[in-house]
């Protein structure tokens, strides 16, 4: 039976041309972690695997970090990068767990936001 | 340019030792996981030990069953160079043994060396 | 013998589409990656796929893997005299904490 929990980041916000860390979080289980994804849509992002460390998908190696711990660092962000993330826990002996974070990516600044939401 | 090269192989009589050394250049084996693979004569391939970067694990290392408590895999990182001590040899570890880095798979092997356990 | 079926051989004739498949019990298959290597007579294996699919720079896109049900595939389009080797399908245990390889296929350029 799986037991377990995950919590993540959930929806969180950046700015473009910044940096955010997607973390998640396996507790309420004694499950072994063996491996952990990390997934944008259906494309692989990253793995770090219990004992190979971590891979870093080609196409992405510029601008992701691993880290830290099990979590991903997304540099130079760019609006493209607006979308839903996945952290997948594969575990010893539950199985699969999976988490989402949806992450927004703003256009510049803080004073352009504002700019944007003046009443005239 | 990324390059693996073993040494060591040579004709040993059952229950002798070998060492086995795979000199690297092109990069920082301390930095790198590589394994040792091995393929008897006509026979596949089999996985016998690899060695995790440092900077993951500590360094770790692992071996296949059939070579527990015999082989010791181990590294000299101001030489670059990756071993392999044999210990107990038998006939069945009679081989080309290959060393070969990488760790979501191995992408660069050297050419072998022979190892021949008879008496 | 390994966890990991193989058939002994394979052909095909130049400019053939073949494929070489490698089964696995149901737990393998789902969750690992696999990775397909190619050893050419008297030569080093080459690491041909990695990740299931991915192919190292310089591999040919005659080359391409994929994976479905319990079984992983390894197809070469175009078949050339050249790609008769001995082709090996692997992947990582983590409960055995080591690399798993079939028993090898053997392709035959006819």
């Known amino acids: 039976m799986m037991t377990g929990t995950i919590e993540t980041t959930g929806n969180i916000s950046a700015e473009k041309g910044g940096s955010i860390i997607l973390q998640c979080h396996l507790s309420s289980t004694t499950a072994q972690v063996t491996q952990v994804n990390w997934e944008q849509q259906d494309q692989l992002l990253a793995i770090c695997n219990a004992d190979l460390g971590w891979h870093i998908s080609p196409s992405f190696k510029d601008r992701v970090a691993p880290g830290p711990g099990l979590g991903l660092t997304l540099q130079s962000l760019t609006v493209n990068d607006t979308g839903e993330y996945f952290c997948i826990y594969h575990t010893y002996p539950d199985g699969t767990y999976t988490g989402r974070i949806f992450l927004e990516v703003l256009e510049s600044s803080v004073a352009e936001h504002g700019a944007r939401f003046q009443i005239p | 340019e990324v390059q693996l090269l073993e040494s060591g192989g040579g004709l040993v009589q059952p229950g002798g030792s070998l060492r086995l050394s795979c000199a690297t250049s092109g990069f920082t084996v301390s930095d790198h996981y590589v394994s040792w693979v091995r393929q008897a004569p006509g026979k596949g391939l089999e996985w016998v030990s690899t060695s995790s970067s440092t900077n993951w694990n500590d360094g770790r290392t692992y071996y296949a069953d059939s070579v527990k408590g015999r082989f010791t895999i181990s590294r000299d990182n101001s030489e670059n160079t990756l071993y392999l001590q044999m210990n107990s040899l038998r006939a069945e570890d009679t081989a080309v043994y290959y060393c070969?880095?990488?760790?979501?798979?191995?992408?660069?092997w050297g050419q072998g060396t022979t190892v021949t356990v008879s008496s | 013998q390994s966890v990991l079926t193989q058939p002994p051989s394979a052909s095909g004739t130049p400019g053939q589409r073949v494929t070489i498949s490698c089964s696995a019990s149901n737990s393998y298959i789902g969750t690992k990656y696999f990775y397909w290597y190619q050893q050419l007579p008297g030569t080093a294996p080459k690491l041909l796929i990695y990740l299931d699919s991915q192919r190292p720079s310089g591999v040919p896109d005659r080359f391409s893997g994929s994976k479905s049900g319990t079984s992983v595939s390894l197809a070469i389009s175009g078949l050339q005299s050249e790609d008769e080797a001995d082709y090996y399908c692997a992947f990582w245990d983590d409960h055995l904490h080591g690399w798993v390889f079939g028993g090898g296929t053997k392709l035959t350029v006819l």
């Open positions: 070969a880095k990488g760790s979501y798979g191995m992408d660069v």
